[in-house]
């Protein structure tokens, strides 16, 4: 089951994911997206990062924290109802079925 | 438009390798998830396996896994799929289908026409 | 691995008729079903990803439907095109695995 972070109507949330890079910089793919994961990537995605850089993001959605030493922590900005629900986090480690997946429960109140 | 172009099936021994080739065409392929798929004589489908865009993350169905390899080349448009140790329960109809991610992963939204895999003695 | 149990597995209407095909996953599945489509000889074609969200191109006389363990794709008045076999998918976990077939047949 999934585990439960809870945020107040107008507050920022913050659901946490983390990996250790195999070096500093050394970064792999990580998407985030609203509901749960599916057997390949992400749905509905709302932020993905590369090798490099924070590559595709939608309006409200930031990592806040060093996401080039594997904090890829979700943050959402000035949530309401309509944000709770289950959250996605995929790091896309390279390899044969190497994924790590977190599903995360996010409850507005 | 989108063009998938499966080639490389034919008749094969048990224990036998061959290497299926899909030449895509109409979208920019590095921008995508490939997979394979089969259909068995029985018409049912199954799914073998699927690549990353870029080739770094590889999934595939665990009675495959240890004898099929795929791959691509996003310089030449391809994807492949290496298969040794077939078996007679490989014998299908194989599909490359394509997996758009980037915003939404959405499974195979374009299909090639197939090739042929028969596996007998 | 999720088995996705669909019924019928064959299907007599007419032109003109309301037809629905039901699938049932073994396990929950979230709203991650696709349907396609396949005539034969012919490789399969997409219909409804998402459950419910149709392919660009496809009738709106196709519409999909479920969410958890149990699907439906409802043809809203059948059109000679649209006898063919149809298949389910789920793509919430691995391995991803499709539904034995409904063959729809003229009657």
């Known amino acids: 089951s999934e585990v439960e972070y809870r945020a107040e109507v107008g507050q920022n949330a913050y659901l946490p994911c983390f990996y250790t890079p195999a070096a500093p910089g050394n970064l792999v793919p990580v998407c985030w997206g609203k509901g749960a994961c599916p057997v390949f990537e992400c749905g509905n995605v709302v932020l993905r990062t590369d090798e490099r850089d924070v590559n595709y993001w939608t309006s409200r959605y930031w990592l806040n924290g060093d996401f080039r030493k594997g904090d890829v922590s979700l943050t959402i900005e000035n949530v309401t109802l309509a944000d709770s629900g289950i959250y996605c986090c995929r790091i896309q480690i390279p390899g044969i079925m190497n994924d790590e997946k977190f599903n995360l429960k996010l409850v507005i109140k | 438009q989108v063009q998938l172009q499966e080639s490389g099936g034919g008749l094969v021994k048990p224990g036998g390798s061959l290497k299926l080739s899909c030449a895509a065409s109409?979208?920019?392929?590095?921008?995508?998830?490939m997979s394979w798929v089969r259909q068995t004589p029985d018409k049912r489908l199954e799914w073998v396996a699927t690549i990353s865009n870029s080739g770094g993350s590889i999934y595939y169905l665990d009675s495959v896994k240890d004898r099929f390899t795929i791959s691509r080349d996003n310089a030449k448009n391809t994807l492949y799929l290496q298969m040794s140790s077939l078996k007679s329960e490989d014998t299908a109809m194989y599909y490359c289908?394509?997996?758009?991610?980037?915003?939404?992963?959405?499974?195979?939204?374009?299909w090639g026409q197939g090739t042929m895999v028969t596996v007998s003695s | 691995d999720i088995v996705m149990t669909q019924s019928p597995s064959f299907l007599s209407a007419s032109v003109g008729d309301r037809v629905t095909i039901t699938c049932k996953a073994s396990q929950y599945v979230d709203t991650y079903v696709a349907w396609y489509q396949q005539r034969p000889g012919k490789a399969p074609k997409p219909l409804i990803y998402s459950a419910s969200t149709r392919h660009t191109g496809v009738p709106s006389r196709f519409s999909g439907s479920g969410s958890g363990t149990e699907f439906t794709l409802t043809i809203s008045s059948l059109q000679p095109e649209d006898f063919a076999t149809y298949f389910c998918?789920?793509?919430?976990?691995?391995?991803?695995?499709f539904g034995g077939g409904t063959k729809l047949e003229l009657k």
């Open positions: 998918a789920q793509y919430s976990s691995s391995p991803l695995t």
């Open positions: 289908a394509r997996d758009p991610y980037y915003s939404n992963y959405v499974p195979m939204d374009y």
């Open positions: 109409g979208f920019t392929f590095s921008s995508y998830y």
